[in-house]
């Protein structure tokens, strides 16, 4: 249940604190590498990488076609890595095709990167299982 909090609507202009913020001075956020694009085949595994660095430590969220990516046990997962985050999709289906975006923020700035995953019909590439063709 929601607790009502009586915060007066009378506005007192004393809220821009006149202090130099260490948080601001030391903060940075960098997209270290654009996200990879992948073309692969049905049944394969694809990995998309979001490579960011920053201070305070960035949080990363994944979107597919502008909707938040929902993890699926044993098939679709994302996890933190030393370089940012990795999204892995196993047993690919053509419905996995789409625009994948990672959005990273360190609390003070925002960066994002978008990659395309294209899952095609037909046999997998002959080079190696899970082969991904970046373009």
């Amino acid at each position: 249940q929601e607790t009502e909090l009586s915060v007066s609507a009378e506005l007192v202009p004393t809220s821009s604190w006149n202090i130099s913020s260490e948080l601001n001075k030391d903060s940075y956020l960098t997209l270290d590498e654009p996200m990879n694009n992948i073309t692969t085949s049905l049944g394969q595994t694809a990995e998309l990488h979001c490579k960011v660095s920053g201070n305070p430590p960035p949080t990363i969220r994944w979107f597919k076609n502008d909707a938040p990516v929902v993890q699926e046990p044993r098939r679709l997962s994302f996890r933190s890595t030393i370089y940012g985050s990795r999204l892995r999709i196993r047993n690919l289906d053509t419905t996995d095709t789409g625009y994948f975006q990672c959005v990273a923020t360190n609390g003070k700035e925002v960066v994002s990167s978008t990659g395309v995953l294209f899952v095609k019909f037909g046999p997998p590439p002959t080079a190696s299982p899970g082969y991904s063709d970046e373009y």
Epitope: W17, V103, V110
Partner: antibody, heavy 116, light 108 residues
Amino acid sequence: EVQLLESGGGLVQPGGSLRLSCAASGFTFTSYAMSWVRQAPGKGLEWVSTISGSGGGTYYTDSVKGRFTISRDNSKNTLYLQMNSLRAEDTAVYYCAQGSSIFDYWGQGTLVTVSS
Amino acid sequence: EIVLTQSPATLSLSPGERATLSCRASQSVSSYLAWYQQKPGQAPRLLIYDASNRATGIPARFSGSGSGTDFTLTISSLEPEDFAVYYCQQRSNWPPCTFGQGTRLEIK
């Protein structure tokens, strides 16, 4: 000294529009995302929208998507919130804040009242 | 969306006493939790970010702890100016960031 000064609030009828502004000074405006956070009378805080430093990325809470538009003019160090199709539940004090989700600088707020 | 639940809703204490405010998340937010103080008619003021880092200019009597789903803001010895409303806020799943409903700290 970082300063954020909101303006543009007022009384508007349901279905109406309003444009809020936030004039920023005392920091490198383009280096930071900027956000709007609101507070309904007697209630808690609610994040509304964020725009990246370049203006290329915009993000909204679900309840305002399609109705509100955040923008910035980096040449004027000013943040905007265009609010259309306003509803009674949008009544709140609207604060602009520096950052996307760690808000260490806030403006003094501007009150938006949606009522017939 | 991650829901933050603060307790108690109201805390009545006297100056000089120790205050312990709690914030619980509906799922893990790692250490990505902040605390804000708000006084009537003023904007919120950042106290703690990322669970335990004091913001610039915040007195040492304010400290934050916790990770995952359970967090605590502690004020070691209350000063008269500390009586206010306190909010927790997560940035783990941004966008959106979400706030708790607030704890009112009042003079006993």
